[in-house]
């Protein structure tokens, strides 16, 4: 049987340098993980030891740290070229800086094919982008050939900024004709590489005839066979085996996120290109794997510009930005308002004439706001200032929740009010009134939310059975600060942009800011 080794990454999100175990900034180098220098060491080790190796990325290299803020994708092309990736699928975040922000730094500079079969360009963009990304690519591996077909979340227009000249088709509908085309070209070993999340990965394995392996991303899914080596809890075995509608066993893999692991899958094919065995596991890229010195030196060279950037002025504030715990954990604070306004602004997507925007609401745990910014320093706001406010390297994500879940979240916000705990919610697009004289779990007496399906936004009472879109920190989406109801009851979760980047972009856009405390959160006693 012919053996293929698939090495894969996904949702790296700008983690070019090594990180701490939780994928935030590396503090103690002896315990740090990931980073492209370490990844290269492991990839080279496997390439030397095994004959037929592919290195694939399933999208979302863009967005996540200051590296992307400064280099805007040039860093992705440079270091992926250095690591000699064989192919990449487009993720939703690759469109964060618009189509131009994808074409110039990445599509034109990448020395490897970038793929998506379900993105179709139209209008003037069609000729401009033609050939810069492909539906599929046939790669020679040894003396065999392997077909790689790409796909991207069809939700991308709601999650990023692809503009109006890209159409995102249904993944399965778009993939099947491309796979059929590969079959007519006598390509009998086909990998679907894409960025639509684990549920869609499994559907592709089940429904798309001719796909032998699915390598996915977007949902940050961790799969592992045996005892996992770090903190991540496996969602299933690696590879996850799906029985296709035509009776084949199709391995599906993903490798968590942030470059912490290198996915490692060995596939055996028979003479007809059928998968006769598959096994492997993600490799934890911990400090036992040395960083490659030449890549590390290159990282250090590129790093210099980042240090300069972090002290440059992004914009000015003419008011004190109150990010103190004494305010943000007890009442509406203007830093919370600023951050929530930035979060909504970052998610402006006019995709439907019926809606002024697809999302109007933001919630933010007060405990996530770690510092104020004093306006008496000439009003200057720098990246460094914002990193003190939002030091955890999180993302601002999009979720869908029922009104009843939101009501539970607001009850949780004040269930032990007065103890300076982090779960007190700052808001945007929401008016909430609490009565602290009532017992915990029954303190929300009014909860109005800003309409989206309206030409003039106004506040309406929350409906318990309605499904709402909300922007919030990934920390809350994952149930942090005791918001288990969000984690357990969310109907959809799409990871968003780096928190500091969202706020810095907003401040740069506004140039001068003056957020106020304006009655988003109120307290009453007795009858309301």
């Amino acid at each position: 049987a012919w053996e293929l080794t698939i090495l894969h990454t996904n949702d790296v999100h700008s983690r070019l340098e090594q990180t701490s175990e939780d994928s935030s900034k590396c503090v103690n180098a002896s315990r740090c993980m990931g980073g492209v220098a370490r990844l290269f060491t492991k990839v080279q080790q496997i390439r030397r030891a095994e004959p037929n190796v592919l290195l694939l990325d399933a999208g979302d290299q863009y967005q996540g740290t200051i590296w992307f803020t400064v280099y805007k994708g040039a860093e992705v092309a440079h270091f992926m070229n250095a690591l000699r990736y064989d192919a990449m699928a487009l993720g939703n975040h690759e469109f964060d800086n618009g189509v131009e922000g994808l074409i110039e730094p990445l599509l034109k500079e990448a020395k490897f094919p970038i793929l998506s079969a379900n993105i179709k360009a139209k209008g003037p963009l069609a000729s401009q982008i033609s050939g810069l990304y492909l539906p599929y690519k046939v790669l020679p591996v040894g003396d065999e050939v392997v077909g790689i077909v790409g796909y991207t979340s069809k939700e991308t227009p709601f999650l990023s900024n692809p503009g109006t000249n890209l159409v995102f088709e249904d993944e399965i509908t778009a993939l099947q004709p491309e796979v059929d085309k590969l079959k007519t070209l006598n390509v009998n070993k086909i990998i679907a590489l894409g960025h639509s999340g684990f549920e869609m990965d499994k559907l592709i394995a089940q429904k798309v005839r001719g796909v032998d392996v699915v390598v996915g991303g977007h949902s940050n899914t961790f799969l592992y066979t045996g005892n996992p080596p770090s903190k991540e809890v496996p969602a299933g075995k690696y590879p996850f085996i799906v029985t296709s509608d035509d009776g084949r066993k199709v391995p599906v893999v993903q490798a968590y996120a942030f470059g912490k692991y290198l996915g490692y899958l060995k596939i055996e094919f028979d003479e007809r290109g059928n998968v006769i065995s598959s096994h492997g596991n993600p490799i934890l890229l911990n400090s036992s794997i040395p960083e490659d010195p030449s890549i590390k030196a290159d990282i250090n060279k590129w790093r210099i510009k980042l240090d300069n950037y972090s002290t440059q002025e992004l914009g000015k504030t003419i008011v004190y930005l109150d990010g103190s715990s004494q305010s943000c954990r007890f009442r509406e604070c203007n830093m919370g308002n600023l951050i929530c306004d930035a979060m909504i602004n970052n998610n402006l997507r006019h995709t439907d004439e019926m809606f002024w925007n697809h999302v109007s609401m933001c919630i933010l745990n007060g405990g996530g706001i770690r510092s104020p910014i004093d306006e008496r320093n000439n009003g200057t706001i720098t990246w460094e200032n914002l990193a003190a406010v939002l030091p955890f390297g999180g993302t601002f994500d999009l979720v869908q929740l029922k009104g009843s879940t939101l009501k539970k979240a607001f009850e949780h916000s004040v269930h032990r009010y007065g103890q300076s705990t982090g779960e007190f919610l700052q808001v945007g697009g929401i008016h909430v009134v609490y009565d602290l004289s009532r017992k915990p779990g029954d303190r929300v007496v009014k909860l109005d939310v800003l309409c989206t399906k309206c030409r003039v936004p106004s506040y309406d009472p929350l409906k318990m059975d309605e499904v709402y879109k909300v922007i919030l920190p990934n920390f809350l989406a994952n149930g942090g600060d005791g918001f288990q109801m969000i984690k357990d009851e969310l109907l959809r979760h799409d990871s968003g942009d780096q928190d500091i980047n969202v706020v810095s972009t907003y401040i740069s856009k506004m140039k001068v800011i003056y957020p106020a405390v304006e009655g988003r959160i109120k307290f009453s006693t007795g009858s309301h």
């Epitope: 012919w2 066993k249 028979d270 003479e271 006769i276």
Partner: antibody
Framework: QVQLQQSGPELVKPGASVKISCKAS????????IHWVKQRPGQGLEWIGW????????KYSEKFKDKATLTADTSSSTAYMQLSSLTSEDSAVYFC?????WGQGTTLTVSS | DIQMTQSPSSLSASLGERVSLTCRAS??????LIWLQQEPAGTFKRLIY???SLDSGVPKRFSGSRSGSDYSLTISSLESEDFVDYYC?????????FGGGTKLEIK
């Protein structure tokens, strides 16, 4: 599509040798093992051995290591099995096989 | 060597009936098992590979499964062309070893 085409039936005398061929098409010959299997009526299927054409490496079942010699010609994508010192016990149908497809079988009759 | 014990060695059944053949492996072979069909003319056709994957062009009435070291081939509704010989084959390690075969006969 993958095909393994074997040579025709053989009638040989005891003590002689015979060389059976198996021509492969529809895939890259050098990348996959070719196995040889013996079938005698009422005796089930017996594995003789394999050859990996890419390297010429071979592996034999203990029972057949002095009986069979496996070779391959990569220029013609053909595998061969030579059977020596034939006796009536060697009368059988011999198959070449990959993991996915089998040859049609070659009938060997050893008779004086 | 890994022994493959196939049962039953022969089976009489009627058209439309559901039947199962079993092979037991003497050592762990994982999912590396093939089911073969041998037609009266002597030609072999692979029905199932990797324990449960259906070969292209093979009718969906054939299916393969595993329970521990027991591997089964099930035919959900017998048709006239199914009354032939069946063999299991393990390819986990050399030497390849086969089950003794099952002759499926029409009742």
């Amino acid at each position: 599509q993958v095909q393994l085409q074997q040579s025709g039936p053989e009638l040989v005398k005891p003590g002689a040798s015979v060389k059976i061929s198996c021509k492969a098409s529809g895939y890259i010959f050098t990348n996959y093992y070719i196995h040889w299997v013996k079938q005698r009526p009422g005796q089930g299927l017996e594995w003789i051995g394999w050859i990996f054409p890419g390297s010429g490496n071979t592996k034999y079942s203990e029972k057949f290591k002095d009986k069979a010699t496996l070779t391959a010609d990569t220029s013609s994508s053909t595998a061969y099995m030579q059977l020596s010192s034939l006796t009536s016990e060697d009368s059988a149908v011999y198959f070449c096989a990959g993991l996915s497809d089998w040859g049609q079988g070659t009938t060997l009759t050893v008779s004086s | 060597d890994i022994q493959m014990t196939q049962s039953p060695s022969s089976l009489s059944a009627s058209l439309g009936e559901r039947v199962s053949l079993t092979c037991r492996a003497s050592q762990d072979i994982g999912d590396r098992l093939i089911w073969l069909q041998q037609e009266p003319a002597g030609t072999f056709k692979r029905l199932i590979y990797a324990t449960s994957s259906l070969d292209s062009g093979v009718p969906k009435r054939f299916s393969g499964s595993r329970s521990g070291s027991d591997y089964s081939l099930t035919i959900s509704s017998l048709e006239s062309e199914d009354f032939v010989d069946y063999y299991c084959l393990q390819y986990a390690s050399s030497p390849w070893t086969f089950g003794g075969g099952t002759k499926l006969e029409i009742k």
